[in-house]
C-alpha cells in the first residue's frame, strides 16, 4: 500500500544540523550559510505501528538514498544505524519494527522513540560534531528534542 511521505530536515533543540559522517553514520553540528546545504534531507514516511494516543509511527529514510535509520542490538545495547534497503520495496506501510520510530510532537518539538526499544530515543550530544545515536535517557545531558523543517523542492 502507498504511504504518505514528506521531505524534511531535522535540527536538535540546540539548532545543530544533521550531516553524513562517512557512509553509514550521521553527526550533529552547527551549520551556517552555504554549509546548510550539507544537512541530510530525510524522507519521513507514515507507517504502521502499535496503537497509541500520542505517538505517530514513522520511518526515516535519507532522501534519494536507499538508507533508513534503524535500531538494532549491538553488543547487547540498542544502537542506531543507517541500513541499506532495496529501493524497489521501500518505503512501505508495514515497515519492519527496527525501522519504526514513534514520533511524539509537543509544541513544535519532536521526539523519535524507537518502536523496537521503547524509551530509547534518537539523540545528539551537547558536544559539536558527535554521532547521532540511540539514547536511553530523556531530560538528561543528551538532546532528544528536534525541530522539523519542510524542504522546498
Amino acid at each position: 500500500a502507498p504511504v504518505r511521505s514528506l521531505n524534511c530536515t531535522l535540527r536538535d533543540s540546540q539548532q545543530k544540523s544533521l550531516v553524513m559522517s562517512g557512509p553509514y553514520e550521521l553527526k550533529a553540528l552547527h551549520l551556517q550559510g552555504q554549509d546548510m546545504e550539507q544537512q541530510v534531507v530525510f524522507s519521513m514516511s507514515f507507517v504502521q505501528g502499535e496503537e497509541s494516543n500520542d505517538k505517530i509511527p514513522v520511518a526515516l529514510g535519507l532522501k534519494e538514498k536507499n538508507l533508513y535509520l534503524s535500531c538494532v542490538l549491538k553488543d547487547d545495547k540498542p544502537t542506531l544505524q543507517l541500513e541499506s534497503v532495496d529501493p524497489k520495496n521501500y518505503p512501505k506501510k508495514k515497515m519492519e519494527k527496527r525501522f519504526v520510530f514513534n514520533k511524539i510532537e509537543i509544541n513544535n518539538k519532536l521526539e523519535f522513540e524507537s518502536a523496537q526499544f521503547p524509551n530509547w530515543y534518537i539523540s545528539t550530544s551537547q558536544a559539536e560534531n558527535m554521532p547521532v545515536f540511540l539514547g536511553g535517557t530523556k531530560g538528561g545531558q543528551d538532546i532528544t528534542d528536534f525541530t522539523m523543517q519542510f524542504v522546498s523542492s
Partner: antibody, heavy 119, light 108 residues
Framework: EVQLVESGGGNVQPGGSLRLSCTAS????????MAWVRQAPGKGLEWVGI???????YYASWAKGRFTISRDNSKNTVYLQMNSLRAEDTATYYC?????????????WGQGTLVTVSS | EIVMTQSPSTLSASVGDRVIITCQAS??????LSWYQQKPGKAPKLLIY???TLASGVPSRFSGSGSGAEFTLTISSLQPDDFATYYC??????????FGQGTKLTVL
C-alpha cells in the same frame, strides 16, 4: 490570534478554473501540513487533499488531475487550484491544519469559501 | 479505499439524554479515528482523535471508544449546545483520508 482565512470563492462556469487561497495568521504555515476539505450544500464533509513540503501532496482519488494544492511560505498561504470545474464541485471549501504531522486530523479550520459552478 | 459508515444518519434526543453514535470502517484502521462536531454555517470542530483522546477544550461529557473497525462517540448527558451534525474520520488510511456521511442530532 491563530487563524486561517480562505478567499477566492465565487461563481464560475462549468469547465472553468478557480484558485482558492488560505492565509494563516498568528503562526507560520511553513512547517504545517495543510489540507483542503469541501462540503456540498446540505451534504457531508469530503477530503480533497493535503500538502506537506511542496513536493509531497496527496489527493482524494476523484481530485487527482483536476485539483492541485500548492504553497507559498513567503506569503504564509496555501492554494487550491481547481480546473475543469463541474456542477458537482459546488461546495464550501475549507482549509485546515493537520494537528500533528501525519496525525490525519484537523484541529484548526478556516471559515470556508463558497464555490458555485453554474452556467 | 476505506469507506466509513455512520449510524444512525439522524438521531432525535432530549437534553440530559445519553447519546451514542457509531462508525464502522470497511477494514481495520486500528485506532486512527477522529470525531468532529459541525453546526450550520460553521467549520467542523475536532472533538476526539485516535479514537478516544479528547481534543483541547472539549467537555468531558464527550467520549470515544473502539478499535479496529468499530467505533462509538458517546455524549453522556446531552446539552442544548450539542445539537449538531457529527462526523467520524479515518485518519490513518495510507495516502487518503475519509469522512463518514454524518449523523444529524436533533431535538426530540
Amino acid at each position: 490570534e491563530v487563524q486561517l482565512v480562505e478567499s477566492g470563492g465565487g461563481n464560475v462556469q462549468p469547465g472553468g478554473s478557480l484558485r482558492l487561497s488560505c492565509t494563516a495568521s498568528g503562526f507560520s504555515l511553513s512547517n504545517s501540513a495543510m489540507a483542503w476539505v469541501r462540503q456540498a450544500p446540505g451534504k457531508g464533509l469530503e477530503w480533497v487533499g493535503i500538502i506537506y513540503d511542496s513536493a509531497s501532496t496527496y489527493y482524494a482519488s476523484w481530485a487527482k488531475g483536476r485539483f492541485t494544492i500548492s504553497r507559498d511560505n513567503s506569503k504564509n498561504t496555501v492554494y487550491l487550484q481547481m480546473n475543469s470545474l463541474r456542477a458537482e464541485d459546488t461546495a464550501t471549501y475549507y482549509c485546515a491544519r493537520e494537528r500533528a504531522i501525519f496525525s490525519g486530523d484537523f484541529a484548526l479550520w478556516g471559515q470556508g469559501t463558497l464555490v458555485t459552478v453554474s452556467s | 479505499e476505506i469507506v466509513m459508515t455512520q449510524s444512525p444518519s439522524t438521531l432525535s434526543a432530549s437534553v440530559g439524554d445519553r447519546v451514542i453514535i457509531t462508525c464502522q470502517a470497511s477494514q481495520s484502521i486500528d485506532n486512527w479515528l477522529s470525531w468532529y462536531q459541525q453546526k450550520p454555517g460553521k467549520a467542523p470542530k475536532l472533538l476526539i482523535y485516535r479514537a478516544s483522546t479528547l481534543a483541547s477544550g472539549v467537555p468531558s461529557r464527550f467520549s470515544g471508544s473502539g478499535s479496529g473497525a468499530e467505533f462509538t462517540l458517546t455524549i453522556s448527558s446531552l446539552q442544548p449546545d450539542d445539537f449538531a451534525t457529527y462526523y467520524c474520520q479515518n485518519t490513518g488510511g495510507g495516502v487518503s483520508i475519509a469522512f463518514g456521511q454524518g449523523t444529524k442530532l436533533t431535538v426530540l
